[in-house]
């Protein structure tokens, strides 16, 4: 019971998450115009990873689009390429988590391939919301630099009667959305890894191995299944012939903790 | 079409306060701000505050203790106040309608005289 | 707040002359999220309120004739009028929509010979 629910809940708080990165990424308040110095603007600035807008007192918002690739700073690209990563990988660990979870019932899918895919899903989420984090964090990097640069030049060369005030970006909406968005990913990932190991059944060697003959010898090895770390082969953890004999542990699944080397 | 009308008291006392309402028609309040400017006689244009669409406002530094601009969507009306007139607040006083975009005032009224004397 | 200077104050031209007025800010009027200038021209004639020629430092108004022409950008900008008739005769004023309070210049006075 506490394993549904620790997985369940980790497929939760890891959808909410995705849901948040999704939107961190298609939102245009990455960066807001710092108003520190000049509350009494008329027009606000705010940029995103895909278009850049201004909003007049008037109601009245314009937002054009980045329209170039190549004239963007690689840090942008860096950022918006690790976004998409986040949300690829969250989507797809959200694929395989709904079919791993214990209560939906899909065919006869064992207990050892569902801890496999709640392992894998948690895998994603965690790397998932890594992503998100580190997107984030870079933009708020750039955005940190680029801060102090543009108060340094504000400070000098302020001669004569005309002053050229720079516009300033500090955090927006957007990095507190994805900060949070990935690290409730990371948490639901790492839920999904907890819910993995009560999933997967022990390793039990039998002396003894019930089966129904079906006319023809066939060898077992004992030790039954062993939930691997992946979707790979492994030879080890594999029956090596199925037969119309099941072994004990096919017949009843016992939810237990495994141990992962 | 557009129009903007003031209406005033005309004349005022020193040290009472001034209400003039601003009518208008062809647009909504609820689409369009609506800004106050006076012209005291001879002398040029001074930007006193506006309302917003939305009901947020913006008023002149040197004015905004003593202002007050408020807006009735549902009659299409929008009402300035201010405190403590003095003689040098003599002036025509006009609103105009905010033009969306770029923040210009493209509609005007005919403006209102408002004259501070005992 | 930002101080708007107009000049000159007035001038007298005759009528086909081509005029050229400037107004000059305490500080830049562009915005550089859209590259925009936030200036707005306005015109007064005697006993009437101002009526709105260029908005966005260069933009003419609908129905404002083709001989007003505003240019200009960041703290210098420049009403000209292309060839100045008889009804042109106003007083000229600039004014700043980017920074509260949208303060307007001292206006430039034009007569017709």
């Known amino acids: 019971m506490a394993v549904t629910a620790c997985q369940g809940l980790g497929f939760v708080v890891s959808l909410i998450g995705i849901a948040g990165i999704i939107a961190a990424t298609c939102m245009d308040q990455w960066s807001t115009q710092d108003l520190y110095n000049n509350p009494v603007t008329a027009v606000f600035n705010y940029q995103g990873l895909w278009r850049s807008c201004v909003r007049e007192s008037s109601g009245f918002t314009e937002c054009r689009g980045y329209f170039t690739l190549l004239g963007l700073p690689a840090m942008l690209q860096a950022v918006r390429a690790l976004m998409i990563v986040g949300i690829v990988l969250g989507a797809i660990g959200l694929l395989v988590s709904i079919f791993a979870l214990k209560c939906i019932r899909i065919g006869s899918m064992e207990d050892s391939a569902k801890a496999n895919m709640t392992l894998t899903s948690g895998i994603m989420f965690i790397v998932s919301g890594l992503c998100a984090i580190a997107g984030v964090s870079v933009f708020a990097n750039m955005l940190v630099t680029n801060f102090w640069m543009s108060t340094a030049n504000m400070y000098t060369g302020m001669g004569g009667m005309v002053q050229t005030v720079q516009t300033r970006y500090t955090f927006g909406a957007a990095l507190f959305v994805g900060w949070v968005a990935g690290g409730l990913t990371l948490i639901g990932g790492v839920m999904m890894c907890i819910a993995c190991r009560g999933l997967a059944p022990e390793e039990t060697n039998y002396k003894a191995v019930s089966y129904h003959a079906s006319g023809h010898s066939v060898a077992y090895k004992p030790g039954g299944f062993k939930a691997s770390t992946g979707f790979g082969s492994n030879t080890k953890n594999k029956k090596i012939y199925d037969g119309g004999a099941r072994t004990e542990d096919e017949v009843q699944s016992y939810p237990s903790k495994h141990d992962y080397v | 079409q557009v129009q903007l009308k003031e209406s005033g008291p005309g004349l005022v006392a020193p040290s009472q306060s001034l209400s003039i309402t601003c009518t208008v028609s062809?647009?909504?309040?609820?689409?369009?701000?609506v800004y106050w400017v006076r012209q005291p006689p001879g002398k040029g244009l001074e930007w006193l505050g506006v309302?917003?669409?939305?009901?947020?406002?913006n008023y002149n530094s040197a004015l905004m203790s003593r202002l007050s601009i408020n807006k009735d969507n549902s009659k299409s009306q929008v009402f300035l106040k201010m405190n403590s007139l003095q003689t040098d607040d003599t002036a025509m006083y006009y609103c105009?309608?905010?033009?969306?975009?770029?923040?210009?005032?493209?509609?005007w009224g005919q403006g209102t005289s408002v004259t501070v004397s005992s | 707040d930002i101080v708007m200077t107009q000049s000159p104050s007035s001038l007298s031209v005759s009528a086909g002359e081509k005029v050229t007025m400037s107004c000059r800010s305490s500080?830049?009027?562009?915005?550089?999220?859209?590259?925009?200038?936030?200036l707005a021209w306005y015109q007064q004639k005697p006993g009437q309120p101002p009526k709105l020629l260029i908005y966005?430092?260069?933009t003419r108004e609908s129905g404002v004739p083709d001989r007003f022409t505003g240019s200009g950008s960041g703290t210098d900008f420049t009403l000209t009028i292309g060839s100045v008739q008889a009804e042109d005769l106003a007083v000229y004023y600039c004014?700043?929509?980017?920074?509260?309070?949208?303060?307007f210049g001292s206006g430039t006075k034009l007569e017709i010979k």
């Open positions: 062809g647009f909504s309040l609820t689409s369009y701000g």
């Open positions: 309302i917003w669409a939305g009901g947020s406002t």
């Open positions: 105009a309608r905010d033009r969306g975009r770029l923040l210009s005032m493209d509609y």
């Open positions: 500080q830049s009027l562009l915005n550089s999220g859209n590259q925009k200038n936030y």
């Open positions: 966005g430092a260069s």
């Open positions: 004014q700043n929509v980017h920074f509260f309070p949208f303060t």
